[in-house]
Interface confidence: low
């Protein structure tokens, strides 16, 4: 790297994966090996992050950027980052100190994250429930008792919910 | 399934050039570190160079001003362009994902170049 | 850059015995620190990596320990499948300060 010509700052001119080497009289230096800056005039390059134990590699390192994490298989992320990775439970679980525990009778989970949500109390809308809940599914609210008089017609439940990524057929 | 393939080795004379392929599947190629090992016969694994994450580039003295790697990201492949090939070139040659974290984690099958008159 | 000395460069051993490979640095590598296993004709399987952590699907008889410029690699119950050579890897060359195999040591069975 050429020593830095800038009047003002000799630093500003040390691009990104470089740093402004004080013990080389401001000389642009390479960062060395596990460490990145992401922006030019650094003094110092950042160390990079390891993903190890339960954090897997979902970007590497280089030279002008930190490594990326995620979780690995069992475990999903949380925090900016992916600071943290907390164990996934089944779907009709939620995750409590003492581990993985069945949602309760009234409560449901769909999915491997998260709380066991109160099934939709379906009389509030004045309306029935039409399918029931499990500890995986919400219930299913259909129309009221009193739209089902004679000659009314018959019910149609909700199309299911598709997955993300599948087109209708 | 999560998988390298090399292709494109063969003989070549000295002086020649040569481009080889490593193709991934089941993953991101952009999201590793790519790496070029070669292995001479009888001999033991020598790195060749790798491209970061970033793009950047790093060689090997050895091979330093005649081989460049590049990679196709809407591909998913990585080459390796070797030029003025020189007969202690001769190896099989292996792609490998690698990186900080892991080391090289995956590799390929490895492809054969020879060169020689 | 960065050398990296495997020793021995072969040994033959009877099944069932503990085997020991080492590998010196030239520098201090901060454990990043990969063994692979070859078998003729076939492409290096990675067993170690961070210097002594296990990868996924190897089994339990292979370890590894070291820190600074000083590992080991370990075979604890030599097994006819081990026959192989093994490599040690220093694989952290974020500013190109050159990624080193040891020279590898061949595995035989008496």
């Known amino acids: 790297f050429e020593r830095t010509r800038s009047l003002q700052d000799p630093c500003s001119n040390c691009p990104a994966g470089t740093f402004c080497d004080n013990n080389r009289n401001q000389i642009c230096s390479p960062c060395p090996p596990n460490s990145f800056s992401s922006a030019g005039g650094q003094r110092t390059c950042d160390i990079c992050r390891q993903c190890k134990g339960v954090f897997r590699t979902r970007k590497e390192c280089s030279s002008t950027s930190n490594a990326e994490c995620d979780c690995t298989p069992g475990f999903h992320c949380l925090g900016a980052g992916c600071s943290m990775c907390e164990q996934d439970c089944k779907q009709g679980q939620e995750l409590t100190k003492k581990g993985c525990k069945d949602c309760c009778f009234g409560t449901f989970n769909d999915q491997k994250r998260g709380i066991c949500r109160p099934w939709t109390n379906c009389s509030l809308d004045g309306k029935s429930v039409l399918v029931n809940g499990t500890k995986e599914r919400d219930v299913v609210c259909g129309p009221s008792p009193a739209d089902l008089s004679p000659g009314a017609s018959s019910v149609t439940p909700p199309a299911p919910a598709r997955e993300p990524g599948h087109s209708p057929q | 399934e999560v998988q390298l393939v090399e292709s494109g080795g063969g003989l070549v004379q000295p002086g020649r050039s040569l481009r080889l392929s490593c193709t991934a599947s089941?993953?991101?190629?952009?999201?590793?570190?790519m790496s070029w090992v070669r292995q001479a016969p009888g001999k033991g694994l020598e790195w060749v160079g790798y491209i970061d994450v970033g793009g950047s580039l790093y060689y090997a003295a050895s091979v330093k001003g005649r081989f460049t790697i590049s990679r196709d990201d809407s591909k998913s492949i990585a080459y390796l362009q070797m030029n003025s090939l020189k007969t202690e070139d001769t190896a099989v040659y292996y792609c490998?994902?690698?990186?900080?974290?892991?080391?090289?984690?995956?590799w390929g099958q490895g492809t054969l170049v020879t060169v020689s008159s | 850059d960065i050398v990296m000395t495997q020793s021995p460069s072969s040994l033959s051993a009877s099944v069932g015995d503990r085997v020991t490979i080492t590998c010196q640095a030239s520098?201090?590598?901060?454990?990043?620190l990969a063994w692979y296993q070859q078998k003729p004709g076939k492409a290096p399987k990675r067993l170690i990596y961070?210097?002594?952590d296990l990868a996924s699907g190897v089994p339990s008889r292979f370890s590894a320990s070291g820190s600074g410029t000083d590992y080991t690699f370990t075979i604890s119950s030599l097994q006819p499948e081990d026959i192989a050579t093994y490599y040690c890897h220093y694989y952290a060359t974020i500013s190109g300060l050159g990624v080193a195999f040891g020279g590898g040591t061949k595995v035989e069975i008496k």
């Open positions: 961070g210097a002594s």
């Open positions: 490998a994902r690698g990186g900080l974290t892991y080391g090289f984690d995956l």
């Open positions: 089941g993953f991101s190629l952009n999201d590793y570190w």
């Open positions: 520098e201090d590598i901060s454990s990043y």
